[in-house]
Each structure stands twice: as C-alpha cells, then as structure tokens.
C-alpha cells in the first residue's frame, strides 16, 4: 500500500513560520499577511516505525521538492539536515532511519523527536530569523513545541 | 574490546532452515544508535547486505531476502539471530554479522563469520 | 536499488605504487559512502567513511574523495599488506548495497 501523506505547515510556539533560508536550511520568523506565503509547506508521510497512542513516526518532506528533514552525526553531532532524494523513490513506508521523527502531541502541542537521536528534538531559537536546528534540550531556552496547520491538496 | 562472534553454520538441505547467532561483547545492543547488520558473501564473490537490527528492534532488510529472512535480538544474551527459512543453493556462503552507530551506516566491527552451504 | 560499479575489477600493482580505485553510483549519494579492505578467509574490515574519514588505526596512505556519484580510494604509497579486495558501500538508500570489490594483486 501506498504511503499515507497530508500537506502541512508548523509553527513554533510562539507564533513563528518556518521558511526556506537557501537550498538546504529552514529558518523561523514571524510572517504576516502576503508574506505566510513564503512559509514552507511540508508533506507529512506516516511510516513504519514504533508507534503509541500520543507518539507517532512521521517523515518531513518539503512539497514538491525532493528534500526530507534527516538528523545525522556531524562532527559528533546531531544535527537536522535538509537531504535531496531521488522522488521516484520517496516518500516510502520504510524510510532510512535518519529520516523519521516521533512525531509526539502533549496538551495540542507537537514535539518532532529524531527517531535517529532520542531526546533530540526539532527546534527553533527565541530569536527572529535563526536556522532550525536538532537541540538536545526540552523545557530551556529554545522551542520545541509546534502546531501543526492542514493544507488542502 | 568489541567482539562479534557468529555461530550456527552448517550444511542444510534446500527447503530447509538454519538460524545463525551473533554474540556481541564489549558493547549493548541497547545503546542509542547501535545497529547490527548481517552481510554475506558467496565463495569467490562479492559482499551482499542481508540485513539490520536498530537498537529499539527497528529492522530492515535486503527485499530479495525479505519474505525468507528474519533478524531478532536478545537484548539479555546481547545476541542478535538471523533466521533462515526456504534456504536455497544460491544462499551458500559466508554469513557476516557487523556493527555499525547510527545512519547512514558503516560498519566498524565485523565477526569472523560462519558458513552455511545449501546443498542436497 | 542503487548499483554500485567499482573500476577496476582487477588491478596489478608494485610496492610503492600510488593506487586509484573509482566507485560509481548509479545515482547521487551524498557523502554516504564507506570503504572496506577484505583478505582471503577474512573479514573485511573499515578502511573511510563518509567519503573521506580515515578510520581510527588505518595509516594514511589510504585517502578517499569524491561527491554525488563518484567516489575514489587512493593508496598513495603501496605496501606489501595492502595487497587485498578492496569494496565500497552505499548507505544513502535502502537496501544498502556494496561494489563488487576490486581485487589488488602484485604485479
């Protein structure tokens, strides 16, 4: 069967976008108006992965570009990457297990937690217009929680 | 020192099944990250990945295996099985189990390997 | 899945010889590419990873470079032990999958 897909934007807590900052970073800023245009609409696939009732393995692809969020070790780091695929092959149920997040709902607030890295978590910065990163922090200073906005087809 | 030792070789008969064990030391097959794959090579030729087992039981494997090879581990023996079902001639060979830490893999540790030949 | 092609199949060498071995994706792999050194009756062993990182212990005559598809291993100056098969491996898609090896022998 197919994978099962939905087109998505996220939005940090505190009300930030996410947008496109060169070919292969997403950073996160406050958008208004016309300008939520530029924000970057994820196509969200369900995959095979360890899954509970508030815990579900979702991959992050950029739709209609062959880029999916991954998490990798750089200089003995995790860190979030934007990853170019081959589209004939992607979205799959069996994603590679850089590539799948835990995506986690507490109080209709989101957490995307590497599958890869546990305790790793997608986050944003407090400050405008900083990259989206992997940071190993829950509850500090930087952002971890999202909503999670449906976008028709 | 890390070691991985595979045993349950032999000879089989086609049709006939075989379950091979890795032992690993010096390590857990629980730490974050940790993955160990299996990876054989028939005489005289090159190296075909079989398999992997994620340290949370996350498993992929080779789709031309898939339906008759099965990766489990017992985390309290930290050993890691490959069962082999519906064998087949061409599945003589070298069978390798190998450690890697996180994707992408490469794989850092290797046993020595144990042989299986399908035969009747 | 991604075909790994590895040139030479066969390559004659001398002791001091610098070595190139080339290994082609069928399509782009990043850097997501692992070098391996296997002797008769062995088990291969890590020589690089991701493209060009020497594994800890391996002596640094052997170098790897290359991006996207194309990929290389150099010996810069051959030693009498380095006379082995030597494989590539893909991790960028699953399944992974190995070159058919490049056997070094002593010309």
């Known amino acids: 069967a197919p994978v099962r897909s939905l087109n998505c934007t996220l939005r940090d807590s505190q009300q930030k976008s996410l947008v496109m900052s060169g070919p292969y970073e997403l950073k996160a800023l406050h958008l208004q108006g016309q300008d939520m245009e530029q924000q970057v609409v994820f196509s969200m696939s369900f995959v095979q992965g360890e899954e509970s009732n508030d815990k579900i393995p979702v991959a992050l692809g950029l739709k209609e570009k062959n880029l999916y969020l991954s998490c990798v070790l750089k200089d003995d780091k995790p860190t979030l990457q934007l990853e170019s695929v081959d589209p004939k092959n992607y979205p799959k149920k069996k994603m590679e297990k850089r590539f799948v997040f835990n995506k986690i709902e507490i109080n209709n607030k989101l957490e995307f937690e590497s599958a890869q890295f546990p305790n790793w978590y997608i986050s944003t910065s407090q400050a405008e217009n900083m990259p989206v990163f992997l940071g190993g922090t829950k509850g500090g200073q930087d952002i971890t929680d999202f909503t999670m906005q449906f976008v028709s087809s | 020192e890390v070691q991985l030792v595979e045993s349950g070789g032999g000879s089989v008969q086609p049709g006939g099944s075989l379950r091979l064990s890795c032992a690993a030391s010096?390590?857990?097959?629980?730490?974050?990250?940790?993955?160990v794959g299996w990876v054989r090579q028939a005489p005289g030729k090159g190296l075909e990945w079989v398999g992997h087992?994620?340290?949370?039981?996350?498993?992929s494997y080779n789709p031309s295996l898939k339906s008759r090879f099965t990766i489990s581990r017992d985390t309290s023996k930290n050993t890691v099985y490959l069962q082999m079902n519906s064998l087949r001639a061409e599945d003589t060979a070298s069978y390798f189990c190998?450690?890697?830490?996180?994707?992408?893999?490469?794989?850092?540790?290797w046993g020595q390997g144990t042989t299986v030949t399908v035969s009747s | 899945e991604i075909v790994m092609t590895q040139s030479p199949s066969t390559l004659s060498a001398s002791v001091g010889d610098r070595v190139i071995i080339t290994c082609r994706a069928s399509?782009?792999?990043?850097?997501?590419l692992s070098w391996y050194q296997q002797k008769p009756g062995k088990a291969p062993k890590l020589l690089i990873y991701?493209?060009?990182k020497l594994h800890s212990g391996v002596p640094s005559r052997f170098s790897g470079s290359g991006s996207g598809a194309e990929f290389t291993l150099t010996i810069s100056s051959l030693q009498p032990e380095d006379f082995a098969t030597y494989f590539c491996?893909?991790?960028?898609?699953?399944?992974?999958?190995f070159g058919q090896g490049t056997k070094l022998t002593v010309k």
């Open positions: 399509q782009d792999i990043s850097n997501y």
């Open positions: 010096g390590f857990s097959l629980s730490t974050s990250g940790m993955g």
């Open positions: 991701y493209t060009s």
């Open positions: 087992i994620w340290w949370d039981g996350d498993e």
């Open positions: 190998a450690r890697n830490r996180y994707d992408p893999p490469w794989f850092v540790d």
């Open positions: 491996l893909q991790g960028k898609m699953l399944p992974w999958t």
